[in-house]
């Protein structure tokens, strides 16, 4: 009974990372409200005048949107009534990094939460046996990383061994002059062993595993975003 805006509602955000040149999502949820027309979602970015995005009365209102976000943002409109205020961001750029605020107003009240959005580049590594080398070696390649990551090798058999003396890592700038291709070669590998190539920067950690036996080669890779 006329309490709109007087109560605080819970708004939850999640620190996330964006891969430059791809779609990103700024995650935000709130207490659901079945009255769509009464929901206002505002996304703001620290240091930017104007809004990143605004959704109200059941539709987008871009009248106050900052130019750097024009044509690059959208909420998941069909999920707003169930409490999803997340923002889809097109063509993530390095300059999109920063502190964002998700502000919500509903018939139940209002609330807001901040999130740190990191931007960079990260990709899955692929390990192959390099038969061109004079001795058997492994080649670990990942097409896009930024900032420059660290690369380390590990082995199941020689746990704790330092492979820096028997590996060579190079970083090749990609055509857009921001991201880099990572190539690391591990020499003198032995058969019937599992090797791991680990690539890490402050945004993501990726691991590629390869098991080489007399009869087959098994590969596996995984990518994990770091929320620190």
């Amino acid at each position: 009974f006329g309490i709109s805006g007087k109560h605080f509602i819970t708004v939850t955000t999640f620190t996330s990372a964006g891969n430059i040149g791809e779609d990103g999502t700024l995650s935000c949820t709130f207490e659901p409200d079945i009255k769509l027309n009464g929901i206002v979602i505002q996304w703001l970015k620290e240091g930017i005048k104007g809004l990143v995005h605004e959704f109200k009365e059941g539709k987008d209102d871009l009248s106050q949107q900052h130019e750097m976000f024009r044509g690059r943002t959208a909420v998941f409109a069909d999920q707003v009534v169930v409490g999803n205020a997340s923002l889809r961001l097109k063509n993530v750029q390095l300059t999109d990094a920063g502190t964002y605020t998700c502000y919500i107003r509903t018939s139940k009240g209002k609330g807001n939460a901040n999130l740190e959005y990191k931007t960079g580049a990260f990709s899955m590594p692929e390990i192959n046996v390099d038969y061109n080398a004079s001795s058997e070696s492994l080649r670990c390649e990942a097409p896009r990383w930024f900032p420059q990551p660290t690369v380390a090798w590990a082995s199941q058999v020689d746990q704790g061994a330092n492979f820096s003396e028997v590996s060579n890592t190079s970083f090749e700038l990609n055509s857009e002059n921001v991201t880099m291709k990572v190539v690391s070669v591990l020499y003198n590998v032995t058969i019937n062993n599992t090797y791991s190539c680990m690539i890490e920067n402050d945004i993501a950690k990726a691991t590629g595993d390869i098991k080489v036996t007399d009869s087959e080669v098994k590969r596996r890779s995984q990518l994990q975003l770091l929320n620190s």
Epitope: I20, G21, E22, L62, G71, N91, S175, T179
Partner: antibody, heavy 121, light 107 residues
């Protein structure tokens, strides 16, 4: 069902202007960008520009800047392309298309039937 | 502005053939590449967007791939209705750009 219905064929003299309309139905007109593309006889597709009907924001291909104006009328859910100082090279089929992704400018997923504009003295 | 260089400009193929069309962006990296099919006298039809996402209703014999500056449309087994002209579109930047087109003809 998304539908874009364009105005009929036009014949214009060099130096004149033409205004092509594109009436949208089957979705919320103000929530999606609308783009314009042209195709000269026997040639490829050429992006002209687009508009966000919800705010009237526009983007234009540099090649057409100064000669092209894209507008909209939200009361009739209609987008317009106006091209001035026409020359024979502007003879083409002009298409309007809705951009996928709502306020996010996506790829063109629904197209009008095309409007043939002929420029001839 | 980003230009899209499409190749080949035309190709002849038979029903059942595997067909590959490529587009090379003049600069930068983003995944915002779409592919269209156009038949004479008709408006273009969206096949694939965001490099590899198939538009609903498009047969699975069409696939897209690519990264960096190089993007590919593949038709795994050409059907009679696939003879048409294909265009790539770069839509990641403020200014959109089409490739020059590839006409797929019957051998």
């Amino acid at each position: 069902e998304v539908q874009l219905v364009q105005s009929g064929a036009e014949v214009k003299k060099p130096g004149a202007s033409v205004k092509v309309s594109c009436k949208a139905s089957g979705y919320t007109f103000t929530s999606y960008w609308i783009g314009w593309v042209r195709q000269a006889p026997g040639q490829g597709l050429e992006w002209i520009g687009d508009i966000y009907p919800g705010g009237g924001y526009t983007n234009y291909n540099e090649k057409f800047k100064g000669r092209v104006t894209i507008t909209r009328d939200t009361s009739t859910s209609t987008a317009y392309l106006e091209l001035s100082s026409l020359r024979s090279e502007d003879t083409a089929v002009y298409y309007c298309a809705r951009l996928d992704g709502s306020s996010y400018r996506g790829a063109m997923d629904s197209w009008g039937q095309g409007t043939l504009v002929t420029v001839s003295s | 502005d980003i230009q899209m260089t499409q190749s080949p400009s035309s190709l002849s193929a038979s029903v059942g053939d595997r067909v590959t069309i490529t587009c090379k962006a003049s600069q930068g990296f983003n995944k915002y590449v779409a592919w269209y099919q156009q038949k004479p006298g008709k408006a273009p039809k969206l096949l694939i967007y965001y490099t590899s996402t198939l538009q609903p209703g498009v047969p699975s014999r069409f696939s897209g791939s690519g990264s960096g500056r190089d993007y590919t449309l593949t038709i795994s087994s050409l059907q009679p209705e696939d003879f048409a002209t294909y265009y790539c579109l770069q839509y990641g930047n403020l200014l959109y750009a089409f490739g020059q087109g590839t006409k797929v003809e019957i051998k």
